[in-house]
């Protein structure tokens, strides 16, 4: 019985060249989180955070992805190509898998506001 819910930062925007925090939070369950995976819109893996062994950032993203805060992920030196969907996948025991979605829009404008609020998808 999966009782938990994933809260995410929902739809967010940030300016080109800047950085943004992708954050998900699992609530309403006592399940043990064994691993969190962060994926891009094309399902390529950005990073994983294994409960026992810590962070693993994929080589292709090592220069632009920083682990944290917490189970979140920080994307740096944003480009227009970073616009799109991002997914957090929480592998838990005994519940199973929870998945959250974030949409990031990278803006050219120097006045782009970094907007983020937690949402339940």
């Amino acid at each position: 019985m999966m009782t938990g819910t994933i809260e995410t930062t929902g739809n967010i925007s940030a300016k080109k060249g800047g950085s943004v925090i992708l954050q998900c939070h699992l609530s309403s369950t006592m399940a043990q989180v064994t691993q969190v995976n962060w994926e891009q819109h094309d399902h390529s893996l950005l990073a994983i955070r294994n409960a026992e062994l810590g962070w693993h950032i994929y080589p292709a993203f090592k220069d632009r992805v920083a682990p944290g805060p917490g189970l979140g992920l920080t994307l740096q030196s944003l480009t227009m190509n970073d616009t799109g969907e991002y997914f957090c996948t929480y592998h838990t025991y005994p519940d199973g898998t929870y998945r959250g979605r974030i949409f990031l829009e990278v803006l050219e404008s120097s006045v782009a506001e970094h907007s983020a609020r937690f949402q339940i998808p």
Epitope: Q32, T34, Q35, N37, L45, I48, N50, E52, L53, G54, W55, H56, P59, H91, Y93, P94, G96
Partner: antibody, heavy 122, light 107 residues
Framework: QVQLVQSGAEVKKPGASVKVSCKAS????????MHWVRQAPGQGLEWMGI????????KYAQKFQGRVTMTRDTSTSTVYMELSSLRSEDTAVYYC???????????????WGQGTLVTVSS | DIQMTQSPSSVSASVGDRVTITCRAS??????LAWYQQKPGKAPKLLIS???SLQSGVPSRFSGSGSGTDFTLTISSLQPEDFATYYC?????????FGGGTKVEIK
């Protein structure tokens, strides 16, 4: 193709330490965790621990905590397992085994080394 | 830790026989179960992951089923190369734990 080549058989005295190596080839070394599993003569499989070759972080089975150390050398794509304070019950074949999938890391092993027999005898 | 109990510990069978091995977990593990085959003097070989997913190159006479706490490995028609020891392993959480093994012997 994926290959894990382990060091040769060892004979050790009780109280000594042994260090077994496992050289990986045929895949990106830092992309897969590595397990160590042992098997005493005529017995079943016993998981000892796991290491992340990228970060070097480890998780050991409680039974071996304080006696086992797993390390890696990314320049040679080699992982090591050192077991100290050896006793006769540690006589076993020691296997390194590559983790199956980092998307679900630490779950199961798909490629195994040929095994290293460690004999502890006075 | 999750305990894995396999039965029987050994089974005698003939070529062509159907062989069934069972594995029970001490707590629910959904479908996170693997089966390995080991021949004397050799390293274990992964046969099945996720309770029923056959690894590439594994003959279709092998099948796995089950979910939760009770799992089964079936060899539909035993071949000479299938005489070996089989181990189940829970694959849901560290520490990894194995069943005690089932030796399939020639009758």
């Amino acid at each position: 193709q994926v290959q894990l080549v382990q060091s040769g058989a060892e004979v050790k005295k009780p109280g000594a330490s042994v260090k077994v190596s496992c050289k990986a080839s045929g895949y990106t070394f830092t992309e897969y965790y590595m397990h160590w599993v042992r098997q005493a003569p005529g017995q079943g499989l016993e998981w000892m621990g796991i290491i992340s070759p990228s970060a070097g972080s480890t998780k050991y089975a409680q039974k071996f905590q304080g006696r086992v150390t797993m390390t890696r050398d990314t320049s040679t794509s080699t992982v090591y397992m050192e077991l100290s304070s050896l006793r006769s019950e540690d006589t076993a074949v020691y296997y390194c085994a590559r983790d199956h999938d980092i998307r679900l890391a630490g779950r199961l092993a798909d490629y195994w080394g040929q095994g290293t027999l460690v004999t502890v005898s006075s | 830790d999750i305990q894995m109990t396999q039965s029987p510990s050994s089974v005698s069978a003939s070529v062509g026989d159907r062989v069934t091995i069972t594995c029970r977990a001490s707590q629910g593990i959904s479908s996170w179960l693997a089966w390995y085959q080991q021949k004397p003097g050799k390293a274990p070989k992964l046969l099945i992951s996720a309770a029923s997913s056959l690894q590439s190159g594994v003959p279709s006479r092998f099948s796995g089923s089950g979910s939760g706490t009770d799992f089964t490995l079936t060899i539909s028609s035993l071949q000479p190369e299938d005489f070996a020891t089989y181990y189940c392993q829970q694959a849901v959480i560290l520490p990894i734990t194995f069943g005690g093994g089932t030796k399939v012997e020639i009758k």
